[in-house]
Each structure stands twice: as C-alpha cells, then as structure tokens.
Interface confidence: low
C-alpha cells in the first residue's frame, strides 16, 4: 500500500466495507466511528449481541463474562470492524475467511490496562483466541485440554492479554491516550477521531 492508502482504508476481511465512509446510525459503542467507518450499521448492531452471527463466537465459553469485561471486547470489535485508521498495521492474513489482518497496532497503555482490570475476574480457557477452539458444535467451545480459569491466570499482565489474545493484533504502547502516538479503542467522537492524527504520524515514517 502507498502512503495515501495507509491513511484512510478498510482492510480486506470478512465484513469490512471496501471503502470507508459515513455511517450515521452506527450502533452504541461503535457510534464514535459514524463520521467515517469501515463497518456497516448491520455489522455494528450484530457485534453487540451476546451470540453474534458475525463469527459465531461465544464470549461466555467459560460461563458468564461480566458486562464490564464484555464492553471492552465489544469496543475491540468496533475498532477492528469500523476503524479506517489502521492502515499501517494491515498485513496479509493467509486465512480462508479473511485476506488481511492487523498486526502490532500500538494500543494506548490505558486502554489495555482498563481492559485487563475489567476482565481479570471473568473466566476463559485459552491464551490465544484465534486458534485451538473446538468448533464441532458450530460455536467455539473449550477443548478438553483447556480448563476454565480466571483471565488473570491466562493473562497475568495487561500486555499478555492485549498482545496475546488475538495473536499480536495489538502491541501495548508506552504512550498514553491523547499523545497522538497510540491507537485509542475508546474516544469521545465529539472531539473528532484521535486515531486520524496517530495514523498520519506512523504513516509518515513507514513510507519515508
């Protein structure tokens, strides 16, 4: 991709639009992206559901995931599906269900810390949610070899969660929200999208 491609682009994956654009009615936690989004209204609605048809992925694979935890996963899904500002981190995926993925997106350290704090008392059975599930029933279930334990057991640090969970889609940044040098999962869209500034910063030296 050339530099202009990096600044405002949707990756080639399962549900993404081909080009970013306004989506005035994006649902709930995805609404910050409504001015310019890679997700459709339908996708934004679907990813808020407990048992979404988008990926047939069950957050509650080890019993109840607390809503405080789940809202971070919803926000993660909104960023993944809706953000047009992740161009510098798009890589070839080589998977049947998507041609591209994100790798090492520099997530603001507070976003990762808060995600980990909110989820530490919920339960899971795996360190990498991209692979190793039992899909025989059509939804993800824990394999027999993977016992349900607290998030804190499988993810002892914030970085182990944010970086390990989706096979290094994120890298925890040393920068803070508002620095212009890390990607924010959470932001107040009335102040604009802070990730637009971030992607310009990274694209400038990725293409120089």
């Amino acid at each position: 991709r050339d530099r202009t491609d990096l600044l405002n682009v949707c990756m080639d994956a399962k549900h993404h639009k081909t080009k970013p654009g306004p989506e005035d009615k994006l649902h709930d936690q995805c609404s910050p992206w409504k001015r310019n989004a890679c997700c459709s209204v339908n996708t934004s609605q679907e990813l808020h559901k407990d048992n979404s048809r988008l990926y047939n992925f069950n957050w509650d694979h080890c019993g109840e995931m607390t809503p405080a935890c789940k809202r971070h996963f919803i926000q993660d899904a909104c960023l993944y599906e809706c953000s047009p500002n992740l161009g510098p981190w798009i890589q070839q995926a080589g998977q049947s269900w998507r041609k591209e993925r994100f790798l090492d997106v520099p997530l603001c350290k507070e976003d990762c810390q808060e995600w980990w704090e909110a989820c530490r008392t919920s339960f899971t059975c795996k360190r990498d949610w991209h692979k190793g599930w039992d899909w025989t029933s059509g939804i993800n279930k824990c394999p027999d070899t993977a016992p349900c334990r607290t998030f804190q057991y499988y993810f002892p640090t914030p970085a182990s969660l944010c970086e390990g969970l989706w096979s290094h889609s994120y890298k925890v940044s040393n920068y803070s929200r508002g620095s212009g040098q890390c990607i924010q999962m959470w932001f107040d869209s009335t102040q604009g999208n802070p990730n637009e500034e971030v992607v310009k910063f990274y694209a400038s030296f990725m293409t120089s």
Epitope: D50, N51, D60, T66, P67, E117
Partner: antibody
C-alpha cells in the same frame, strides 16, 4: 417493541414444584441471555443466575444450586424457571430480565408457598 | 462477592428539593447501575454505566462516582420520583444489588 411476559401468580404447598415462564418478543431471543432475579416480600433484589439462550447452558449462584433449574423452549422464545421441593423461603416474586444490561424485565411472577 | 451498601435506607424530600443517595461498594467496581422500582411493579433500568440515563429517564436525574463510591442525584424532586432505587454492579461475578433507598415525597 421488546417485551418479556411472565406467567401468572402461583399458590403452592411446601414440597411441590413450580415452573414459571418468561416469553420474549420484539427481538431475536437467542441473541441475548436471560437472567432470573428473586425479590422476597419487602426485600431487595437477588440475582439467581442466567441461561445462555444460544447454547442452553445455565449458570446458578451458590444460593440457587440444587432445587432450581433454568430451561428454554427456543422455538417459542421462552425461558423457564423451575423450583423443586418448594420451601417457605422460596415465597417471593421472580423476575426474568434480559442479560447483560438488564435493560428489559418481565412483570414478575408471585409464588406463594402455604400449607 | 462485592457487597453494595446504600444510604440512607429511607429518605423523604419536598417537591423541588435536591436529592442525593449513595452506594458504597466493598471492593472497587468499574461501573455502577441504578434501577427504579415502584410498589408492585418490576424494576426499570434507570442509570447505567455510572452516569448514562436510560431511555425515557428525565434529565433531572444524574449519576456519578468511581471506585467504591457512587451516587444518584435528582436536581429537583418531583412526585413521580417517589420509588425505591437499587444500585447494582456487574464488574465482578456474581452481580449484586444494594439493599435499596426508599425515596418518599413530603
């Protein structure tokens, strides 16, 4: 519009069984789990647990393990709470509430236990 | 489990008066939610994620707080606000409710 409609009041004797229904409408039933909440007369709200309407898997809090059972009739968009071997302390109003945000509640079902 | 303590248990306010009730958590929670319940009816979601008003809730209501200390405020009491208000957390399993604050109109 979204509605949760519960079955009517029940009068039972100690040792009997009661089964309360909660019929959902206005949304896709299997997209949201269902909570059950107990309110004893003049008391506060107590979460009993929930059922995953997609997988059918129930989760019970410690106080409601054993005699209590959550179940589903997915084709009818209905969740059930069954209480076996009723005791006096089970006398309460039971509410179903849509999972997570508890944004929609049933009107409640009063269960009276009297010999 | 996290214990939520509401105070006061019962309070009364005159029309137009400012009302504040509190909810204290035994451990830090990420968000607090509030439900309104009137006698003989089911609870209604009133305030969620600490400060967001549920659909149809009048703007005179507000919620605030963090950590272990949260509050619900009514800027100007009206007769229809008389009810019992429950705080609730679901930052940690199991979700728990406070014992309620009964608000009466003078």
């Amino acid at each position: 519009q979204i509605q949760l409609v519960q079955s009517g009041p029940e009068l039972k004797k100690p040792g009997e069984t009661v089964k309360i229904s909660c019929k959902a409408s206005g949304y896709t039933f299997t997209n949201y789990g269902m909570n059950w909440v107990k309110q004893a007369p003049g008391k506060g709200l107590k979460w009993m647990g929930w059922i995953n309407t997609y997988t059918g898997e129930p989760t019970y809090t410690d106080d409601f393990k054993g005699r209590f059972a959550f179940s589903l009739e997915t084709s009818a968009s209905t969740a059930y709470l069954q209480i076996n071997n009723l005791k006096n302390e089970d006398m309460a109003t039971y509410f179903c509430a849509r999972k997570g945000a508890m944004d929609y509640w049933g009107q409640g079902t009063s269960v009276t236990v009297s010999s | 489990q996290i214990v939520l303590t509401q105070s006061p248990a019962i309070m009364s306010a005159s029309p137009g008066e400012k009302v504040t009730m509190t909810c204290s958590a035994s451990s830090s929670v990420s968000y607090m939610h509030w439900y309104q319940q009137k006698s003989g009816t089911s609870p209604k979601r009133w305030i969620y994620d600490t400060s967001k008003l549920a659909s149809g809730v009048p703007a005179r209501f507000s919620g605030s707080g963090s950590g272990t200390s949260y509050s619900l405020t009514i800027s100007s009491m009206e007769a229809e606000d008389a009810a019992t208000y429950y705080c609730q957390q679901w930052s940690s399993n199991p979700p728990t409710f406070g014992s309620g604050t009964k608000l009466e109109i003078k």
